[in-house]
């Protein structure tokens, strides 16, 4: 079995302020079992945007039904985009761990740019 890869096909996306951003991410394997998380930025100061396993993320919806059998699409939509949302977003696969899940592999990132609303 080939090792899982996290594919973020869009290097960048441009969204108008007030609109919804779609950030695409797919995994290439069902193995290992474990959730996906989305972050803005990299390194220790990265900001958690969405966690499949737990948490409340009112601006974020998933494109696919995560409970769908054999789902490997972890794309998200972020609503009501503002200039403060600009940055590089990473889709990160975790593998099931005990007691905590362990980061396994990250996508290459998608840069979100925000176009100001015309005044």
């Amino acid at each position: 079995e080939e090792e899982l890869q996290v594919i973020q096909p869009d290097k960048s996306v441009l969204v108008a302020a007030g609109e919804t951003a779609t950030l695409r991410c797919t995994a290439t394997s069902l193995i290992p079992v474990g959730p996906i998380q989305w972050f803005r930025g990299a390194g220790p100061g990265r900001e958690l945007i969405y966690n499949q396993k737990e948490g409340h993320f009112p601006r974020v919806t998933t494109v696919s039904d995560l409970t769908k059998r054999n789902n490997m699409d972890f794309s998200i939509r972020i609503g009501n985009i503002t200039p403060a949302d600009a940055g590089t977003y990473y889709c990160v696969k975790f593998r099931k761990g005990s007691p905590d899940d362990v980061e396994f592999k990250s996508g290459a990132g998608t840069e979100l740019s925000v176009r100001a609303k015309p005044s």
Epitope: L30, V33, G34, K53, E54, L66, T67, R69, N70
Partner: antibody, heavy 119, light 110 residues
């Protein structure tokens, strides 16, 4: 971490119904399937049914389709399994189990609820 | 429905020796390159514990003396060097369609 806490032991008369609960914590309840499995004394495991808490989609073992009903309460992250028209051979430990990979498997288990059916 | 048949029903193995449990499906449990077989360990008075998923992948925290193999209809759980704490009943389960379990194999120390 993931925890599934089940309701206490029950003693029921033949012909009665029982409703077993399974309270989930440590994860987003609506993102993962819940399975129900039973085990009669000294016997093997028997899959009853599964439910997707996000939309209440259910799949039943044909053997239980007419007597078992699965429900969830997303406000309390609790899953329920009701079994009707109880018979003595329904005496068993009833387990709930969470499917962490949408593979129709059982990654995390409750401790079980003993249901005794006796006149 | 796919029926899973485990063999043997019971097995006694010396400490440090290899234990092998088989699981045969009545039809293929493979789909899209994956083998939908899972192995569980159950000790007395406890719920089952997932050991192996998708035929050959060790679950988190499971010692690497456990391994799974096979494809199509024939699958094997192997414990390379039996430890006292491995005494339990072992079950295979498929999810090619709706889940079913094998009847279980009781593993004891010789």
């Amino acid at each position: 971490q993931v925890q599934l806490v089940q309701s206490g032991a029950e003693v029921k008369k033949p012909g009665a119904s029982v409703k077993v609960s399974c309270k989930a914590s440590g994860y987003t309840f609506t993102n993962y399937w819940i399975n129900w499995v039973r085990q009669a004394p000294g016997q093997g495991l028997e899959w009853i049914a599964m439910i997707d808490p996000s939309d209440s989609e259910t799949h039943y073992n044909q053997i239980f389709k007419d007597r078992a009903t699965l429900t969830t309460d997303t406000s309390t992250s609790t899953a329920y399994m009701e079994l009707r028209s109880l018979r003595s051979d329904d005496t068993a430990v009833y387990y709930c189990a969470m499917d962490y990979g949408s593979l129709y498997a059982m990654d995390y288990w409750g401790r079980g609820t003993l249901v005794t059916v006796s006149s | 429905d796919i029926v899973l048949t485990q063999s043997p029903d019971s097995l006694a193995v010396s400490l440090g020796e290899r234990a092998t449990i088989n699981c045969r499906a009545s039809k293929s449990v493979s789909s899209s390159g994956y083998n939908y077989i899972f192995w569980y360990q159950q000790k007395p008075g406890q719920p089952p514990k997932l050991l192996i998923y998708l035929a050959s992948n060790l679950d988190s925290g499971v010692p690497d003396r456990f391994s799974g193999s096979g494809s199509g209809t024939d699958f094997t759980l192997t414990i390379s060097s039996l430890q006292a704490e491995d005494v339990a009943v072992y079950y295979c389960q498929h999810s090619r369609d709706l889940p079913t379990f094998g009847q279980g194999t009781k593993l004891e120390i010789k």
